[in-house]
Interface confidence: low
């Protein structure tokens, strides 16, 4: 199928990194970098499982789909894909599994048609807040990105900076409000314990959000209200115990939503009553008949849809004078 046809914009030589980062010689039309496979007809270049340590400088100008998976890139510097003339048609860039541990500010600058970016399966210990926005301005030029795949980018425990991994990722997503047009965001398998409360409100175009296989315990402070276009929300394989009324109402109010909640350790006590009532009425939960209780022990494996209010009790909290040590 066809892809973007943006005209190549000329570079200003005043850009500070261009002297070192930009390939000055235009590549020959049919040139293919060493260790890569190229198809001009498919506008595709594949440099896969080649243990490359840097992005090839001589990428053909026609490239629309670039696969640089299974390499050893380690660091993506500023302007890693800046070329003269620019790679004006590059729309899909897959860098998954390339041992990236650092993505610097402006790494994806000068890619005017970049719609889809996959950085999955890289241990990103250092993701610059300006990796996607390219500048530290409070409001950056809009990024053309509409699909950002960041599954399993959490580094091993001993390689993490002394800061919140969730915070680092969210800072990159929100910097300069550059990703306002983002439509698909995948953040699966990242050990997220929480979702910073402001992140979704600033990504209003999202259609698909994948937060599966994390460690989310609660959505109490997360608002979905602004995500009026959201079509799928993947929350499978987290540590969710219950969804409260506010969250339920917000999800129910989204016109196109499908929610996936499998494999969470639902706690079936008195706090679950609202969620069970909602589940029985709603059509937005995919596979709702598969949801089962994990706690308390007496409720384990009970199907949520089959519970009634009598099943959902909380042990009474005794006044201090009656408690035993």
């Amino acid at each position: 199928s066809s892809s973007p046809t943006s005209s190549a914009s000329s570079f200003s030589s005043s850009a500070p990194f261009l002297a070192s980062a930009v390939s000055a010689q235009p590549p020959l039309p049919d040139q293919c970098p060493a260790l890569c496979e190229c198809s001009e007809a498919a506008r595709t270049v594949k440099c896969v499982n080649r243990n490359l340590t840097e992005v090839p400088t001589d990428l053909p100008a026609y490239v629309r789909n670039l696969f640089l998976t299974g390499n050893q890139l380690a660091v993506l510097p500023a302007g890693a894909f800046a070329r003269r003339p620019p790679l004006a048609e590059l729309a899909a860039l897959n860098l998954s599994g390339s041992r990236l541990d650092e993505v610097r500010a402006g790494a994806f600058e000068h890619l005017p048609s970049l719609r889809q970016l996959d950085l999955s399966h890289n241990p990103l210990a250092d993701l610059s807040p300006f990796a996607f926005s390219g500048s530290n301005a409070s409001v950056s030029a809009p990024s053309p990105l509409v699909e950002l795949i960041l599954n399993h980018i959490v580094p091993p425990e001993d390689e993490r900076q002394n800061r919140s991994f969730e915070g680092m990722v969210v800072a990159a997503l929100l910097a300069g409000r550059a990703l306002q047009g983002l439509r698909r965001l995948e953040l699966a398998s990242n050990h997220f314990l929480y979702l910073p409360r402001d992140v979704l409100a600033q990504l209003p175009s999202l259609r698909h959000l994948d937060l599966s296989n994390n460690s989310l315990v609660s959505l109490t402070y997360v608002s979905f209200r602004n995500l009026t276009h959201l079509e799928s929300l993947h929350l499978e394989d987290n540590a969710l115990k219950v969804l409260h009324n506010g969250t339920l109402a917000e999800l129910q109010g989204l016109p196109h939503i499908r929610v996936f909640l499998d494999n969470n350790p639902w706690v079936c006590d008195c706090h679950m009553a609202d969620m069970v009532t909602w589940l029985k009425e709603t059509e937005v939960v995919q596979g709702k008949d598969r949801l089962t209780c994990a706690y308390p022990e007496k409720m384990r494996n009970r199907v949520l849809l089959e519970l009634n209010s009598a099943d959902l009790d909380c042990d009474p909290i005794l006044p201090p004078s009656l408690q035993t040590s």
């Epitope: 066809s2 973007p4 719609r115 079509e231």
Partner: antibody
């Protein structure tokens, strides 16, 4: 080769029912989004209904509660069940794939491509 | 819902001439706009998507431009088979909506 072949149109009285079919070849109806779009005689195009790959269905306000979109995965066929038909439902009805033009497993923006050949539904007494 | 207004309603031109069709949205649709061509008795055909990208198999004489609320479809040099009705369509906000169409006819 991708093809959408429609059938089921015809003349029906107000208040009556009709079921349109759209047989798909070249891709699987269950793995894509599918829509119905209609065109009243001499008029423009109006989106009617959509079914997502996950099974969610949505309708234009003008047909909500009267029309039902569905599919039969085993027959690779899309349906539009139209009940309580009115004169203003008279139109050529087209099925169309709601297509992501960039590929690479993305769903970020979808357009109607390709379309079925259309089938005329006339509601008149 | 977003209203798309196309102009002119009819464009009378000769083969070889340049056609410029306009589509204006009642609010911003970013670049989430497509153009379709429909010939009498036929189904519409996707020409341009995401405002400026040609669909598969569409000749280079068709081009799209614009973003936000103002969009243009240009046919650089009309061929006999290009005389048809052209519709714009947005996919930015729900529901999907179409313009009322511009008819390009032979002068």
């Amino acid at each position: 080769q991708v093809q959408l072949v429609q059938s089921g149109g015809g003349l029906v009285q107000p208040g009556g029912s009709l079921r349109l079919s759209c047989v798909v070849s070249g891709f699987t109806v269950s793995s894509d989004y599918m829509s119905w779009v209609r065109q009243a005689p001499g008029k423009g195009l109006e989106w009617v209904s959509i079914i997502y790959s996950g099974g969610s269905t949505f309708y234009a306000d003008s047909v909500k509660g009267r029309f039902t979109i569905s599919r039969d995965n085993s027959k690779n066929t899309l349906f539009l069940q139209m009940n309580s038909l009115r004169a203003e439902d008279t139109a050529v009805y087209y099925c169309a794939r709601d297509r992501d033009c960039h590929g690479w497993g993305s769903y970020y923006n979808r357009w109607f491509d390709p379309w079925g050949q259309g089938t005329l539904v006339t509601v008149s007494s | 819902e977003i209203v798309l207004t196309q102009s002119p309603a009819t464009l009378s031109l000769s083969p070889g001439e340049r056609a410029t069709l306009s589509c204006r949205a009642s609010q911003s649709v970013s670049s989430y706009l497509a153009w379709y061509q429909q010939k009498p008795g036929q189904a519409p055909r996707l020409l341009i998507y995401d405002a400026s990208n040609r669909a598969t198999g569409i000749p280079a004489r068709f081009s799209g431009s614009g973003s936000g609320t103002d969009f243009t479809l240009t046919i650089s040099s009309l061929e006999p088979e290009d005389f048809a009705v052209y519709y714009c369509q947005q996919r930015s906000n729900w529901p999907p909506t179409f313009g009322q169409g511009t008819k390009v006819e032979i002068k």
